[in-house]
């Protein structure tokens, strides 16, 4: 059985990184875009485009930047204070319950339903029953039941890199 609990000092060890900017921690914390040195004496800047930290922190390292997958587009690059922002390519979307991959949007609604919402990077097309106006469950209909409402953009599934 092993262990994370309370109070013991780290053996001091100086961090050798002369190419990175240093400053002193403020009340034991370093500003966004920095992490703390192994001995706790210095704040060391993150490397632009490689790693980042978003808040005041005492992290022992900056966090690695996310790399957008081939099925994604990069909305904004990684900076020292913000991670990369990736978005599913046109015609694909990422669901909350399966955030690790972009799924292809349906090209149309089942028979008897009408499209009320377009494919977006975060949602599939939205279908409702013509009469009742209730939402479709989101299950992909059989091909022969599909009523095409827009051509849709073919796209391959993608994995969210971590």
């Amino acid at each position: 059985e092993s262990a994370l609990i309370t109070q013991q000092d780290l053996a001091p060890q100086q961090r050798a990184a002369p190419q990175q900017k240093r400053s002193s921690p403020s009340e034991g914390l370093c500003p966004p875009g920095h992490h703390i040195s192994e001995d706790g004496r210095d704040c060391i800047s993150c490397k632009y485009g490689q790693d980042y930290s978003t808040h005041w922190n005492d992290l022992l390292f900056c966090l690695r930047c996310t790399r957008c997958d081939s099925g994604e587009v990069e909305l904004s690059p990684c900076t020292t204070t913000r991670n990369t922002v990736c978005q599913c390519e046109e015609g694909t979307f990422r669901e909350e319950d399966s955030p690790e991959m972009c799924r292809k949007c349906r090209t149309g609604c089942p028979r008897g339903m009408v499209k009320v919402g377009d494919c977006t990077p975060w949602s599939d097309i939205e279908c409702v029953h013509k009469e009742s106006g209730t939402k479709h469950s989101g299950e992909v209909p059989a091909v022969e039941e599909t009523v095409t409402s827009s051509p849709g953009t073919p796209a391959s599934p993608c994995s969210l890199s971590g």
Partner: nanobody, 126 residues
Framework: EVQLVESGGGLVQPGGSLRLSCAAS?????RYWMYWVRQAPGKGLEW???????????YYRDSVRGRFTISRDNFKNTLYLQMNSLKSEDTAVYYC???????????????????GAQGTQVTVSS
């Protein structure tokens, strides 16, 4: 009950290699960051390496970077540390630990070893 059982330590000559393992049980292993920490004789706990929950991101303290490799098998609930080019200053008891995020200075500074924790002894000596 959370259990972390380390193994694979031993006596090795400088320049030699060892592979440490940590068998985890009692929690959802794949949801947690995992660390290796060590305690040299008469010294405090020292963070060695960390790996995120999915295993895609690995981090090392400066003195072991390029020599040690951390990895995990989320199907076997096991954490590993491959230690190459060992030096006398790597001599310590090595422990694995679970956490909800990356290691911070304050977290490592306030870490202690549970009385029941065994760790695995690594001795580098000629």
């Amino acid at each position: 009950e959370v259990q972390l059982v380390e193994s694979g330590g031993g006596l090795v000559q400088p320049g030699g290699s060892l592979r440490l393992s940590c068998a985890a049980s009692g929690f959802t292993f794949s949801r947690y960051w995992m660390y290796w920490v060590r305690q040299a004789p008469g010294k405090g706990l020292e963070w060695v390496s960390a790996i995120n929950s999915g295993g895609g991101d690995t981090y090392y303290r400066d003195s072991v970077r390029g020599r040690f490799t951390i990895s995990r098998d989320n199907f076997k609930n096991t954490l590993y540390l491959q230690m190459n080019s060992l030096k006398s200053e790597d001599t310590a008891v090595y422990y694995c630990a679970k956490a909800e995020g990356p290691p911070t200075f304050s977290l490592i500074r306030t870490m202690t070893v549970d009385p029941g924790a065994q760790g695995t002894q690594v001795t580098v000596s000629s």
